[in-house]
């Protein structure tokens, strides 16, 4: 009597149980009474990442350098190619499929957490007492400059864009 | 399609040096370029590959004190710096097959440029 | 760190004959190796790509095979021509991982 059901990694087709292709093999032909499946390994960027009954092999992932992205991971027969961004560059998505430049914190902001693969830079406004004079991706708020410490008063004071400016006391006469 | 490299010549433990790769009918948009270095009577090693982004990676023991970078729409460079006498070689570019990966093989050679490093 | 090893480091055969030069990974590549034939003053010359793949022109003399960690470069019908130094070369993914062998040198009688 014909099966209607098969054991794991195979299929039924014709009436009988055959054995599915392995990861990074695809189908070339059902078996029979007399053969085995035949199955062939997936070509150069191809892949089959479950046993399967496939006549064609998946295309690899392409990481388009236009998008930003570059191959972080290669593909095998078995597994697709990853992508990730190219530096100073974050993906936009889970799937990574396109990247963005990181942002800059401007004049006046800090960063609070540098930017990563997959995660923008998060920038903070520069307390008081703190200043960023310029736009950058990596530029903590940097303290002001104590006058105290170099024996120096304070002849200008320091604002979130500016450190203070420093100069000699006024010597008494 | 051709790449020549220039620049090698005779330099003093502890030295720098600029090598040039220029490359004719080839569009280094659409191009990864690697270099490759061949010490006297040795074997072939790798030092580094940049992709179409400029975007770079290098051999492990290269990290620090090779540099590559695109220069123009027709040249790559290789600045090395603190040369040692292990640095003599003959050093290739190389066109690779990707635009988009440090890890390619090479299917153009230039012809070579020697570099000796000798008090 | 990743090691790729090239034998025999020289081999000798007549006109005519065949000649095997094996590579071994320390860690799987899948199929990624490239072998690359040259002689003696000029540059390497890629023969072949991902195992198997044979650049344009070049003989289907030359046959490569394998995955994973063991890989084989067979010429037959030898010819003086081929006398010169060939080198297997992974190009999977770690920085350690893009290296070439040491080369096998071919001798032709």
């Known amino acids: 009597e014909p099966p209607t059901a098969c054991r794991e990694k195979q299929y039924l087709i014709n009436s009988q149980c055959c054995s599915l292709c392995q990861p990074g093999q695809k189908l070339v032909s059902d078996c029979t009474e007399f053969t085995e499946t035949e199955c062939l390994p997936c070509g150069e960027s191809e892949f089959l990442d479950t046993w399967n009954r496939e006549t064609h092999c998946h295309q690899h992932k392409y990481c388009d350098p236009n998008l930003g992205l570059r191959v972080q991971q290669k593909g095998t027969s078995e597994t697709d190619t990853i992508c990730t961004c190219e530096e100073g560059w974050h993906c936009t998505s889970e799937a990574c499929e396109s990247c963005v430049l990181h942002r800059s914190c401007s004049p006046g902001f800090g960063v609070k957490q540098i930017a990563t693969g997959v995660s923008d830079t998060i920038c903070e406004p520069c307390p008081v007492g703190f200043f960023s004079n310029v736009s950058s991706a990596f530029e903590k708020c940097h303290p002001w400059t104590s006058c105290e410490t170099k024996d120096l008063v304070v002849q200008q004071a320091g604002t979130n864009k500016t450190d203070v400016v420093c100069g000699p006391q006024d010597r008494l006469r | 399609q051709s790449l020549e490299e220039s620049g090698g010549r005779l330099v003093t433990p502890g030295g720098s040096l600029t090598l040039t790769c220029t490359v004719s009918?080839?569009?280094?948009?659409?191009?990864?370029m690697g270099w490759v270095r061949q010490g006297p009577g040795k074997g072939l090693e790798w030092i580094g590959t940049?992709?179409?982004?400029?975007?770079t990676d290098y051999a492990n023991w290269a990290k620090g004190r090779f540099t590559i970078s695109k220069t123009s729409s027709t040249t790559v460079d290789l600045k090395m710096t603190s040369l040692t006498t292990e640095d003599t070689a003959t050093y290739f570019c190389?066109?690779?097959?990707?635009?988009?990966?440090?890890?390619?093989?090479?299917?153009?050679w230039g012809q070579g440029t020697l570099v000796t490093v000798s008090s | 760190a990743f090691e790729l090893t090239q034998t025999p480091a020289s081999v000798e055969a007549g006109v005519g004959g065949t000649v095997t030069i094996k590579c071994q990974a320390s860690?799987?590549?899948?199929?990624?190796l490239a072998w690359y034939q040259q002689k003696s003053g000029q540059p390497p010359k890629l023969l072949i790509s991902?195992?198997?793949k044979l650049a344009s022109g070049v003989p289907s003399r030359f046959k490569g095979s394998g995955s994973g960690t063991e890989f084989t470069l067979t010429i037959s019908d030898l010819e003086c021509a081929d006398a010169a130094t060939y080198y297997c070369q992974s190009y999977f993914t770690s920085d350690d991982a893009n290296s070439f062998g040491g080369g096998t040198e071919v001798v032709v009688k």
């Open positions: 009918g080839i569009d280094l948009s659409t191009n990864g």
């Open positions: 860690q799987s590549i899948d199929r990624y």
């Open positions: 190389a066109r690779g097959h990707a635009n988009n990966d440090a890890y390619v093989y090479f299917n153009l």
């Open positions: 940049i992709r179409v982004t400029a975007g």
């Open positions: 991902y195992t198997s």
